[in-house]
């Protein structure tokens, strides 16, 4: 039995489940999805398929399977069972497919803001509007004094009035795409708290 391979696919995109079986004399391969029969491919190239005929092809003329126009519910376990006359038992290759959406622009919200002794302190939180899965967030802090990266969805900010302005950008990534937020300027962000030296706002 082969190892379990994790495969990522993009919504509306395609994915190929690759079989590397050059050393074996294959008679036929049976493909299943969550135990449901998908296709059988014989060595003469003849295939018998269940549904999804328009979405499943065997591109190399051999046994690897390409699945197109991916939907969210295509996520799951795929299995290739390889039958050979030269082997008593069938060989098995298993895959787990996860279909991801392309990320839209992440949204940024500001937490409670305080202004003490001319220093504006707050948190910026980055998130995807529709709560997408497996998203990794990175913050870029840009300015004359800094060019730093910060991992995680929450960025703690401490900016002193009179310092050069800073720009904050949130970058969101998932296995199939990446996107970034609108830039946020420290000066604009902190303007609300500027009038009152000890103010707090949400």
């Amino acid at each position: 039995s082969g190892t379990l391979k994790k495969v990522a696919g993009a919504l509306d995109g395609s994915v190929t489940f690759t079989l590397n079986i050059t050393e074996i004399k294959v008679d036929y391969v049976v493909w299943t999805f969550n135990t449901f029969f998908l296709a059988m491919v014989k060595k003469d190239g003849v295939t018998s398929q269940s549904s999804n005929k328009e979405r499943i092809v065997f591109p190399d003329g051999l046994y690897s399977m390409k699945l197109s126009q991916l939907k969210k519910n295509d996520s799951g376990a795929y299995r290739a069972e390889i039958y050979s006359t030269s082997s008593q038992a069938s060989l098995i290759q298993e895959y787990v497919l996860h279909v991801y959406k392309h990320l839209s622009r992440p949204k940024v919200t500001m937490g409670l803001q305080s202004n003490k002794n001319g220093t504006c302190v707050t948190n910026l939180t980055c998130c995807m509007e529709h709560g997408e899965e497996d998203v990794i967030y990175t913050w870029k802090a840009l300015g004359q004094a800094a060019n730093e990266s910060h991992n995680g969805s929450i960025l703690p900010i401490s900016w002193r009035w009179g310092e050069s302005d800073m720009t904050f950008i949130c970058v969101a990534r998932n296995p199939v795409s990446r996107n970034f937020s609108s830039p946020i300027l420290a000066r604009k962000l902190c303007e609300g708290a500027a009038d009152d030296p000890d103010s707090s706002m949400v």
Epitope: A8, L142, T167, I169, V171, V176, S177, S182, P183
Partner: antibody
């Protein structure tokens, strides 16, 4: 040292095909999005497309989508550009480029490989 | 596609001078703009990203500015080694697009 080295360029007839390669070294190739960019003689830069680390997403400039195919082999640390149905306007220097920190701007470029389309 | 227009194909300057190269986007790209330098016979080299952040090792005489649709690369105290083509690039939306380039000539 981080390096990209393109190869496979040459003279090709109109309507013909060619496959370019880009060998990467000095960094973890399997973690990076990678792009192809071309530059026609005496002209500006044109982004062709990009591929994500596991090949599940490939984005192209719309006008080139039907004639170019980008692929990669992480085991070989190599990026590919399959060109088909080439025309004289595809004559250019072809660069592969790596985005800085996986962002969208390119800090590492190869020296390029020249493709000349002529009969 | 977003069109990046560099209206000056050529710019002439003298060593020690200050020169500004402009780039105009056909629609708002925020600050998602990079600048590259390409010396004769060489590959492009990243100078500026996020409109104004200098890439590692780039001399501080190179300054990027702008947001929205209008961007500028300013070279102060121009040196003879700055003779090159300069390209802007937007990465706000697909497909990424470059300006046509500005060739800086040293008098």
């Amino acid at each position: 040292e981080v390096k990209l080295l393109e190869s496979g360029g040459g003279l090709v007839q109109p309507g013909g095909s060619l496959k370019l390669s880009c060998a990467a070294s000095g960094f973890d190739f399997s973690r990076y999005w990678m792009s192809w960019v071309r530059q026609a003689p005496g002209k500006g830069l044109e982004w062709i497309g990009e591929i994500n680390p596991d090949s599940s997403t490939i984005n192209y400039t719309p006008s080139l989508k039907d004639k170019f195919i980008i692929s990669r082999d992480n085991a070989k640390n190599t990026l590919y550009l399959q060109m088909s149905k080439v025309r004289s306007e595809d004559t250019a220097l072809y660069y592969c480029a790596r985005p800085d920190g996986n962002y969208w701007y390119f800090d590492v470029w190869g020296a390029g490989t020249t493709v000349t389309v002529s009969s | 596609d977003i069109v990046m227009t560099q209206s000056h194909k050529f710019m002439s300057t003298s060593v020690g001078d200050r020169v500004s190269i402009t780039c105009k986007a056909s629609q708002d790209v925020g600050i998602a703009v990079a600048w590259y330098q390409q010396k004769p016979g060489q590959s492009p080299k990243l100078l500026i990203y996020w409109a104004s952040t200098r890439h590692t090792g780039v001399p501080d005489r190179f300054t990027g500015s702008g947001s929205g649709t209008d961007f500028t690369l300013t070279i102060s105290n121009v040196q003879s080694e700055d003779l090159a083509d300069y390209f802007c690039q937007q990465y706000s939306s697909y497909p990424y697009t470059f300006g046509g380039g500005t060739k800086l000539e040293i008098k």
